[in-house]
Amino acid sequence: WSSKVLMSSANEDIKADLILTSTAPEHLSAPTLPLPEVQCFVFNIEYMNCTWNSSSEPQATNLTLHYRYKVSDNNTFQECSHYLFSKEITSGCQIQKEDIQLYQTFVVQLQDPQKPQRRAVQKLNLQNLVIPRAPENLTLSNLSESQLELRWKSRHIKERCLQYLVQYRSNRDRSWTELIVNHEPRFSLPSVDELKRYTFRVRSRYNPICGSSQQWSKWSQPVHWGSHTVEENPSLFALEA
């Protein structure tokens, strides 16, 4: 592969990019080291962390992160105001709620300030990168003699934006039974055996109405219902992480 200096797009891809290309070289120059990828997640729409693998740099380098939104009043990049560090080297940026626009294309630029030609621009759909908090306040109630209802709460995110994965099992089950619940933070189990002890847990994701996040939240704290008889082989039915 030959190296080639080209002038790149003026939209946001500031000029004089050094690229590797298989086309005939116009200007020969040493290829630059690729920058690490930036990965961003929006945590419960409260803050966003954009991180990179700083240890992939051959020398300790304080890379800088700038960002903007595709459609905004001020089309210029702004520098990260709250860097995250790993071994005293920048490895991420935390962006606060007031700077998060879920439904605008997020443009993020990582740059080596010592070598301005070492620069990578990525575009991200933030609505697909939301990770909710684990569901909270799981409560069980009897709808009838054998019917149970499980309810829970999610903080800061509209219920209609979330999809839930409910898992339950009894002390006689080797594996979880699981099902998807859309938008409604409740689930009913039509038939329970009062001689069994049941465990329930829930997690959520920002999908599919308001975004298409594939990332599930952490599991809720488990809740239990039913007989407190000693399990025959407790180790066999230990709660999985």
Epitope: D17, L18, L20, Q39, Q109, K123
Partner: nanobody
Framework: QVQLVESGGGLVQAGDSLRLSCVAS????????MGWFRKAPGKEREYVAI???????FYEDSVEGRFTFSRDNAKNTVYLQMNSLRPEDTAVYYC????????????????????WGQGTQVTVSS
């Protein structure tokens, strides 16, 4: 070694359509960020459409709604469907690939792409 070969360019009238193809050999594109770029005479190279392997696709403002990026991993091929072509779309169109770790990585900076095709000429007459 990865080779990218573009095809599908040509001379068309304003308002017509073209479909560009880019076939890769040497490695799978299934875990690559992909980009279509163009270079018009006297202008800088600019991105036209970029895509992460997770499926997020972004377009340059002037082509949004007219151009569509797609990929067929089974054929190791990416496409650029160009509709309602305009004279200002005249350029050499390049396909580019960047192996990435994350499904969400889509690069609009040309220096982020490791592999490039030789380009295919698209000319739109008025």
């Amino acid at each position: 070694q990865v080779q990218l070969v573009e095809s599908g360019g040509g001379l068309v009238q304003a308002g017509d359509s073209l479909r560009l193809s880019c076939v890769a050999s040497g490695r799978t594109l299934s875990r690559c960020a992909m980009g279509w770029f163009r270079k018009a005479p006297g202008k800088e190279r600019e991105y036209v459409a970029i895509s992460s392997w997770g499926g997020d696709t972004f377009y340059e403002d002037s082509v949004e709604g007219r151009f569509t990026f797609s990929r067929d991993n089974a054929k190791n091929t990416v496409y650029l469907q160009m509709n309602s072509l305009r004279p200002e779309d005249t350029a050499v169109y390049y396909c580019a690939a960047a192996p990435t770790s994350f499904a969400t990585t889509a690069y609009s900076s040309s220096n982020s792409y490791a592999y490039w095709g030789q380009g295919t000429q698209v000319t739109v007459s008025s």
